[in-house]
Interface confidence: low
Amino acid sequence: DTHKSEVAHRFKDLGEEHFKGLVLVAFSQYLQQCPFEEHVKLVNEVTEFAKTCVADESAENCDKSLHTLFGDKLCTVATLRETYGEMADCCAKQEPERNECFLQHKDDNPNLPPLVRPEVDVMCTAFHDNEATFLKKYLYEVARRHPYFYAPELLFFAARYKAAFAECCQAADKAACLLPKLDELRDEGKASSAKQRLKCASLQKFGDRAFKAWAVARLSQKFPKAEFAEVSKLVTDLTKVHTECCHGDLLECADDRADLAKYMCENQDSISSKLKECCDKPLLEKSHCLAEVENDEMPADLPSLAADYVESKDVCKNYAEAKDVFLGMFLYEYARRHPDYSVMLLLRLAKAYEATLEKCCAAADPHECYAKVFDEFQPLVEEPQNLVKQNCELFEQLGEYKFQNALLVRYTKKVPQVSTPTLVEVSRNLGKVGAKCCKLPEAKRMPCAEDYLSVVLNRLCVLHEKTPVSEKVTKCCTESLVNRRPCFSALELDEAYVPKAFNAETFTFHADMCTLSEKEKQVKKQTALVELVKHKPKATKEQLKGVMDNFAAFVEKCCKADDKEACFAEEGPKFVAASQAALA
C-alpha cells in the first residue's frame, strides 16, 4: 500500500521512541566515526521534520523517499571528507546509488577504542541524571561498532540495558546486581551481531535464493507441524525483513518485523505449539522470543521421504516443472524430519540432491540413475558428525583455553598470511564452540556446533575481504556459502608460505602483563603463540607446548618478583633464546 509520505507512515507505525532509536542506529551504522552529539542533532532534525509530515503529508519534501531524506541529512555533515575520505564521494551520487555507496563503506572493523566500563556508581549517576541520553549513547556505541547489527533487536537490547540499570542502581550491592547483567548483554550482543552479519553476507554475497534456502531449512526444523505453504509465507516475509535491515532500511525492517510477529501470533495453530508464551509479551520481547523459539515436536506420522523423492517415477517431471519449489519442498520435508542436523548440512544435502537430478534427469534411465541418491548423503552426514565428535573429545580433554590454543595452531598453519589479531579473535571464538555445544545432548550438538562455526567463519571472511591476503581464504569464503566450514576444515599446512622472520620485539613483555585481566593475559599469550607458528609453521605440538609452558612459567615468575620490570628485562631475552633453540 502506498503512502503520500513514507516518513510520516513509518513515524506513525513505529511511534516516536522507536523511530528516533532506529534513525540513530541507522546514522551511527553509516557514519561510524561521527561524535555522539552530531548524531543526536541529526536525529532530532529528522524527527522534527517527520512530525511536520505527520501533521501534513503534503508538506514540502514529505513525499521524498527515506533514502533521499536520510542521505541528504548525512551529507550535511561538515567534516565528511576529512573524517571519511572517499566516502564523501557518495554524496555526489543520486539515489539509489548513493545509499549503495554508503553501504559499501560500512566498516566491519572500525578503528574505535574498546569500550571501557566505568565504575558502577559513575554509570548509575549518569543513568539517573539523564536516562534518555544514557540509552541513546548505548545505541550509538553498539551501532557504530557493529554496522550490521539487527536494528529492531538492538532496541530490545537497549530495553534490557535500561531495565538492568533501573533495577540494579537501587540495589544494596549495585555491582553484584549489575555487572553479571552487563556481561550477559555484552556476550549476547556480540553473538547477535555475528549471527546477523552472516544473514547479511548470505543476502549480499550469495543472493536471496541462498537466504531463502537457509530460512526454509531453519523454519522447517522449528515448525515441523506447519505446512509447506505456511513455511513458504514465513520465509518470504522473513527474507523481506532481513533484506531491508541489511540494506539500511531500518524503519521498514522494524515495521515489517512487527507485522511478521503479529501474523505469527494470529496464526499459531498452523505454525507451532511453542509460540504461545512469546505472544503474550510486548513487541520487542515478543519478536526476540519468536526468533529464538525452540523447535516444535515433529509430527508422529511423517511418511518416508523416499516415496516422493526417489521411488516415484515422476521425480524428474516434478523437478523439471518447477525446480525451486520442488527443491524447496524437498528441503522442507528433510529439515522437518531432522532437527538433529545443522542447517548447513541440510543445505548441502539439498545441493547434492539437486546435482543428482540435474545429472540423472538427462540420463537414459533417470530412475535407475537417481535410485541410490540417499546413499550418497551418508558421507555428507558423517563428516560433520565425526568433526563434532573429535573436537568435543579434544575440548573435554583440554579445557577451553588449551582447546583455543589447539585451534590457533591449526588455523595459523592453514592460513598463516592472515593477520595475528584476526587469527586470535577468530580462533578464540571457534574455541568457544566447546563450552557452547559439547555439553548438549547428541541430537543438539551438530546443529549447535556447525551453525555456530558458520557464524564465526563468516567473521573471518568479512575481515579478510577488507584486507585480502590469502587466496585460500578468498576461495573458501566465496565459492560456496554452505561449504565454507568443510572448505576450511580441509585446508592443510600451507607449504608455499615463507616463514616470518623472527622479531624479538614481538616476544618482549613488560610488567604491565601482571595487571591484565585473565582474558587479556590469554590474548597476549595466544598472540605470541600465533607469532611462533608464523615463525616456525612446521613446529610440532610438543615443541609449541614446551615453549608455551615456559612462557607461562616465565610470566608467573616475573609477576611474583619484587622488581617485576627488572625481571621481565632479564628473563625475557633468556626465554626468547630458549624458545628459538627449542624450535630450531
Epitope: E227, F228, A229, S232, K233, L302, P303, A307, D308, S312, D314, K317, N318, E321, A322, V325, F326, M329, E333
Partner: nanobody, 115 residues
C-alpha cells in the same frame, strides 16, 4: 507465498458424488504437476491422484481408479477432483498438493460418506 485452498467437501450418502476444488496462488500453477492426497482419521496420508502441468497425463491410486477423475483449469489456477460412487472408506480430509507428494500442504476439506 504458496497458498492452496480446498473446497467442495461435505456429507454424502454411499454411491453419491462430490466435486472438490483447489484454488492455488503464489506460484505459476500451469508449470506444476498437482496431486490430491487424503488422510482418514487415525491413519497416515494416502496419495489419491496426480495430474501433469498440462492436464494430459493423469494417475490414480488403485482404490479410486474408475470412480475419481482429476482435472485442472490453468486459466483459473484451479485443480478439481470429481468423486463418483463414493464409499464409506473414502471418508477423509482431502488435500491438494504440489507435485506428487504425500505430504499435506494446506488445511484440506472434509469428505464424509455415511448413510
Amino acid at each position: 507465498q504458496v497458498q492452496l485452498q480446498e473446497s467442495g467437501g461435505g456429507l454424502v450418502q454411499p454411491g453419491g458424488s462430490l466435486r472438490l476444488s483447489c484454488a492455488a496462488s503464489g506460484f505459476t500453477f500451469g508449470s506444476f504437476g498437482m496431486s490430491w492426497v487424503r488422510q482418514a482419521p487415525g491413519k497416515g496420508p494416502e496419495w489419491v491422484s496426480a495430474i501433469d502441468s498440462g492436464g494430459a497425463d493423469t494417475r490414480y491410486a488403485e482404490s479410486v481408479k474408475g470412480r475419481f477423475t482429476i482435472s485442472r483449469d490453468n486459466a483459473k489456477s484451479t485443480l478439481y477432483l470429481q468423486m463418483n460412487s463414493l464409499k464409506p472408506e473414502d471418508t477423509a480430509v482431502y488435500y491438494c498438493t504440489i507435485g506428487r507428494s504425500s505430504s499435506r500442504g494446506s488445511q484440506g476439506t472434509q469428505v464424509t460418506v455415511s448413510s
